[in-house]
Amino acid sequence: SSPTSSASSFSSSAPFLASAVSAQPPLPDQCPALCECSEAARTVKCVNRNLTEVPTDLPAYVRNLFLTGNQLAVLPAGAFARRPPLAELAALNLSGSRLDEVRAGAFEHLPSLRQLDLSHNPLADLSPFAFSGSNASVSAPSPLVELILNHIVPPEDERQNRSFEGMVVAALLAGRALQGLRRLELASNHFLYLPRDVLAQLPSLRHLDLSNNSLVSLTYVSFRNLTHLESLHLEDNALKVLHNGTLAELQGLPHIRVFLDNNPWVCDCHMADMVTWLKETEVVQGKDRLTCAYPEKMRNRVLLELNSADLDCDPILPPSLQTS
């Protein structure tokens, strides 16, 4: 999902050149210090160079910009605003650059930005207006089509006194700027829940990756608005069962493929509807691999091989008959 480059010939800028030209305006298409540039591939790579800020002298031709493996810490408003603007910049990869704060309007003045990867940054402070650029109730539409936010959860001791899920969702929903978003990756973020309003406001989503989180239930999540969703990745969560409402919604999405591997499915009486659905549906990828985790007597049983007699719930004893 991250921007890739087919560049074969990159010109490097030696560090000593930077100071030599810093007093005068940058040349239009020079290559920033500590970066590699290929005008033919429209690609600039400033990778693993411990940069503490975004280079100011990025060439106007840049279409793919890699700023991975740096020490950026903060992305301020207008971090990529240039005169003339970086009008061609379509793919921006900032993964693994130790960002802990992304401020409002950080990506403003990038009219062609379609792919943004902020993965593997401990984002303790993601402004609600990081992607929308303004606090208007309806912002100008963002050009973003793909937003990759895998493993952006900060260590617990660095989190603000608020829900991390809520912070991320606020940024996704602000100003309805991301109505055109087609791919959203939120894997490996310790999400315990998915706020119920988030999906309703991202109607163009085709691919949603929520894998490797801690989702226990989808009861309050609605997929109905995601009319053209093609992939829903829910692998490696803490899901126990999918209930009828969710099953019906997924079955009603004609283009969806659902990925459910490695969840601790509880094979009791509440699982009966899901087992019936799994036997009939074509939408679940690798459904024959899904196995029970609980109760102990059912561990490793294949869901598709279960029948109603296997799926029982221990009767709940009335309080007078319970022993301590």
């Epitope: 999902s1 992939s231 493929r257």
Partner: antibody, heavy 115, light 107 residues
């Protein structure tokens, strides 16, 4: 922008098999679904089937089932449609179309079945 | 299979006219109805998906409405470049099926 480039025209004898390719570029924003559609000369459009390129899952139109095989090679971003036991009524232009709602189409491949 | 019935099969109109094409499904398809434009010798192009959503880059003179079984496609002000055949298609229930097409000509 997603672009689909199909292989060239084919002339086949009745009973033969044809395999058409469709290469996707602009892949970052393309769909996982690749559809195939038939258009006989002067006629309308008929959906043949589709493949989910990431895992190879397919759906076919019953009218073509048993004679058609759709495959995909993710390493080359190419999808294929193979139609066997060809007959004269299979003479048509075959299109690949990317997306759930068939957002982008290839230029078409004319297959002529004639003895 | 769901049958899609398009009408009229051909239509003649003048530049600037408002043009309407209808499509009827043999059973409920919710809003999973797409409209395509095909010019002679060319591949079809998606104009509208999910009944009324405009595909990227499609002029706003094209619009769609309806739900369930009855759908309408409208060109608010016909332009010379709109001369083509238009197809509706449902993608609610496999196999996907197309209408028979409407050939649009200039008077």
């Amino acid at each position: 922008e997603v672009q689909l480039v199909q292989s060239g025209a084919e002339v086949k004898k009745p009973g033969a098999t044809v395999k058409i390719s469709c290469k996707v570029s602009g892949y970052a924003f393309s769909s996982s679904w690749m559809n195939w559609v038939q258009q006989a000369p002067g006629k309308g459009l008929e959906w043949i089937g589709r493949i989910y390129r990431e895992d190879g899952h397919t759906n076919y139109n019953g009218k073509f089932k048993g004679r058609v095989t759709i495959t995909a090679d993710t390493s080359t971003d190419t999808a294929y449609m193979e139609l066997s036991s060809l007959r004269s009524e299979d003479t048509a232009v075959y299109f690949c179309a990317n997306g759930g709602a068939m957002d982008y189409w290839g230029q078409g491949t004319l297959v002529t079945v004639s003895s | 299979d769901i049958q899609m019935t398009q009408s009229p099969s051909s239509l003649s109109a003048s530049v600037g006219d408002r043009v309407t094409i209808t499509c009827r499904a043999s059973q409920d398809i919710s809003n999973y109805l797409n409209w395509y434009q095909q010019k002679p010798g060319k591949a079809p192009k998606l104009l509208i998906y999910y009944t009324s959503r405009l595909h990227s880059g499609v002029p706003s003179r094209f619009s769609g409405s309806g739900s369930g079984t009855d759908f309408t496609f409208t060109i608010s002000s016909l332009q010379p470049e709109d001369i083509a055949t238009y197809y509706c298609q449902q993608d609610n229930t496999l196999p996907w099926t197309f209408g028979g097409g409407t050939k649009l000509e200039i008077k």
